[in-house]
Interface confidence: low
Amino acid sequence: KESCDVQLYIKRQSEHSILAGDPFELECPVKYCANRPHVTWCKLNGTTCVKLEDRQTSWKEEKNISFFILHFEPVLPNDNGSYRCSANFQSNLIESHSTTLYVTDVKSASERPSKDEMASRPWLLYR
């Protein structure tokens, strides 16, 4: 019998390189049974994760899994950083691994920024 615990399937150390100015959807894959849990997104700021309360989110339901989506419309330079989704289910809080967005300039979309570039272009730095 399959477990009915809620599970969040963000891979450890997952990353996305995304283009500033484009729309983007950050997906949190959620597995649950009968009752869909309450899921939220937060953005890491040092050791704390700041809840993203005023952001557009939506659910996408598929046959064996659901996705809780954080919408970036469009991506801005300071969206750079690490995000985590968490689910409240039967008084339990389940947290995902963090996923990191690398926001890249139109001019360097084909390459991940080097440490030198990140030092010279502050908006690429983790905030």
């Epitope: 557009q56 919408h71 801005l76 300039d105 502050p122 908006w123």
Partner: antibody, heavy 116, light 107 residues
Amino acid sequence: QDQLQQSDAELVKPGASVKISCKVSGYTFTDHTIHWMKQRPEQGLEWIGYIYPRDGSTKYNEKFKGKATLTADKSSSTAYMQLNSLTSEDSAVYFCASSNWNFDYWGQGTTLTVSS
Amino acid sequence: DIVMTQSHKFMSTSVGDRVSITCKASQDVGTAVAWYQQKPGQSPKLLIYWASTRRTGVPDRFTGSGSGTDFTLTISNVQSEDLADYFCQQYSSYPLTFGAGTKLELK
């Protein structure tokens, strides 16, 4: 040629509401956010907010929350901004603009005059 | 909110001159800055984005520079059609904000 065509000038009384339109042509309406700006004489531009026509999601400048409501009609490729409880402070030229966060394409502007 | 300060409300120039319009951000915005030109009765026109990238079709006498908090729009060999208002805008974070504008006029 990408174009944003705004509705004509409006003269309205204090306390009333007004709805300004911005019709898009030349590109797929649902591909880009539509932003709205306010400009008063001898003053700079203020960003009001945007709507993403693909799903109707919006983001507002806190200063304009409760004042402006942004909507979009995909069938006519038109974005709308409704301004309510109008006062003389709302008298301005309002622009719609497109192409994400820096604005390649602008409407011609709609002049709103609030006067009794 | 990030405040974009254009310290000169007016700048006087002559045809053929070189003029620099400055803009200062209240906090680090990286290179997420655009410059616009606006003539009376018209909507603004994008000149520069990412602080220094000239929009296609904009004459190469318009040059943008800067990063962090200090930005400059330089117009070399000023032409009469360049007499207009110039605004900077940051798009590093919401709300998007604009400078108050600098009006370029003839001496």
